[in-house]
């Protein structure tokens, strides 16, 4: 798997999308996990609803939300109030039994808020020793969720 880079601004929301073949992954729940080291395990952050037919319901774990468009084949993860410690390598996963298929490897980069004049030394970027070959950069422009916003796709 190539690694896709998503860049977000500290303090704002970052939306990560993971497209997949909806038929191939039909009936499978999804998860978002954080890679612990280059060869380490991927630690589960949040997973979709335990009933696959309700996968479109937004589920939160702390400041991270997940929602799955199972018909369209797009898993969406929202990292709210992005912080420097959120930077790192993640995976979108498709679950089947105790196994997990990787849908996409994601590198989250946290950029300094241009309106924030604090020391940018806290921000994390992949070092030269960490090679993410063929990494594709996606600048994700997202908005913060509004209070009381319905956690469902909009009506047509």
């Amino acid at each position: 798997h190539n690694t896709t880079v998503f860049q977000g601004v500290a303090g704002q929301s970052l939306q990560v999308s993971c497209p997949y073949d909806s038929m191939k992954h039909w009936g499978r729940r999804k998860a978002w996990c954080r890679q612990l080291g280059e060869k380490g395990p991927c630690q589960r952050v949040v997973s979709t609803h335990n009933l696959w037919l309700l996968s479109f319901l937004r589920r939160w774990n702390g400041s991270t939300a997940i929602t799955d468009d199972t018909l369209g084949g797009t898993l969406t993860i929202t990292l709210r109030n992005l912080q420097p410690h959120d930077a790192g390598l993640y995976q979108c996963q498709s679950l089947h039994g105790s196994e997990a298929d990787t849908l996409r490897k994601v590198l989250v980069e946290v950029l300094a808020d241009p309106l924030d004049h604090r020391d940018a030394g806290d921000l994390w970027f992949p070092g030269e020793s960490e090679s993410f070959e063929d990494a594709h950069v996606e600048h994700s422009i997202s908005r913060s969720l509004l209070e009381g916003e319905i956690p469902f796709p909009p009506t047509s």
């Epitope: 009936g27 609803h49 037919l53 479109f56 939160w60």
Partner: antibody
């Protein structure tokens, strides 16, 4: 008029099978997820399972206590949802209701149930 | 599974009274909660969805509020036709109902 009518209930011995039907009218049946619930005499409501709209191709979900014994299916041409109940136990005795999930847009629905049938009684006893 | 604790299990109030029922979830369910009314011998009827949204055609004297683990259902002015059992239902994890609250007229 939007309506759901259940049928097929009755007295059945433990270990036997029974099939309930839920006939829908007044709405486009294929656009909606359909669910089954039950209510034991004098008790509260319990979700049994549901089946997705036509877009989901008959995908089903069940509560743990009936998984492997009960099967939900739907016939779009007749606008009927079925609940096939096998290996029935005395604790399955209840009024069984079918209900329609609220619809948001194509494929998307809401697990709030806005139309219910009148219910059909299932008694499992020897 | 998420447990839904509804209280009180029964109450008696006068016509015109404000009636409040609470539902507590065993863990955070955001606003994934619905309220139903069930009259004796009848099927349940959806009143409130997403914790606070009034279902179409339901009188405005019914309302719901809350998020996280604590939810409230209110009848602002009890009417004779409101005699029923009221249930909360969560859908954050599977689907489970509260034990119900039976509302009677004094």
């Amino acid at each position: 008029e939007v309506q759901l009518v259940e049928s097929g209930g009755g007295l059945v011995q433990p270990g036997r099978s029974l099939r309930l039907s839920c006939t829908a009218s007044g709405f486009t049946f294929g656009d909606y997820a359909m669910s089954w619930f039950r209510q034991a005499p004098g008790k509260g409501l319990e979700w049994v399972g549901f089946i997705g709209s036509k877009a989901y191709g008959g995908t089903t979900e069940y509560t743990a206590s009936v998984k492997g014994r009960f099967t939900i299916s739907r016939d779009g041409s007749k606008s009927i949802a079925y609940l096939q109940m096998n290996s029935l136990k005395t604790e399955d005795t209840a009024v069984y209701y079918c209900a329609r999930g609220k619809r948001y847009s194509y494929g998307y629905w809401h697990p709030a149930f806005d139309v219910w049938g009148q219910g059909t009684m299932v008694t499992v006893s020897s | 599974d998420i447990q839904m604790t509804q209280s009180p299990s029964s109450l008696s109030a006068s016509v015109g009274d404000r009636v409040t029922i609470t539902c507590q979830a065993s863990q955070d369910i955001t606003n994934y909660l619905n309220w139903y009314q069930q009259k004796p011998g009848k099927a349940p009827k959806l009143l409130i969805y997403d914790a606070s949204n009034l279902e179409t055609g339901v009188p405005s004297r019914f309302s719901g509020s809350g998020s996280g683990t604590d939810f409230t259902f209110t009848i602002s002015s009890l009417q004779p036709e409101d005699i029923a059992t009221y249930y909360c239902q969560q859908y954050d994890s599977y689907l489970t109902f509260g034990g119900g609250t039976k509302v009677e007229i004094k």
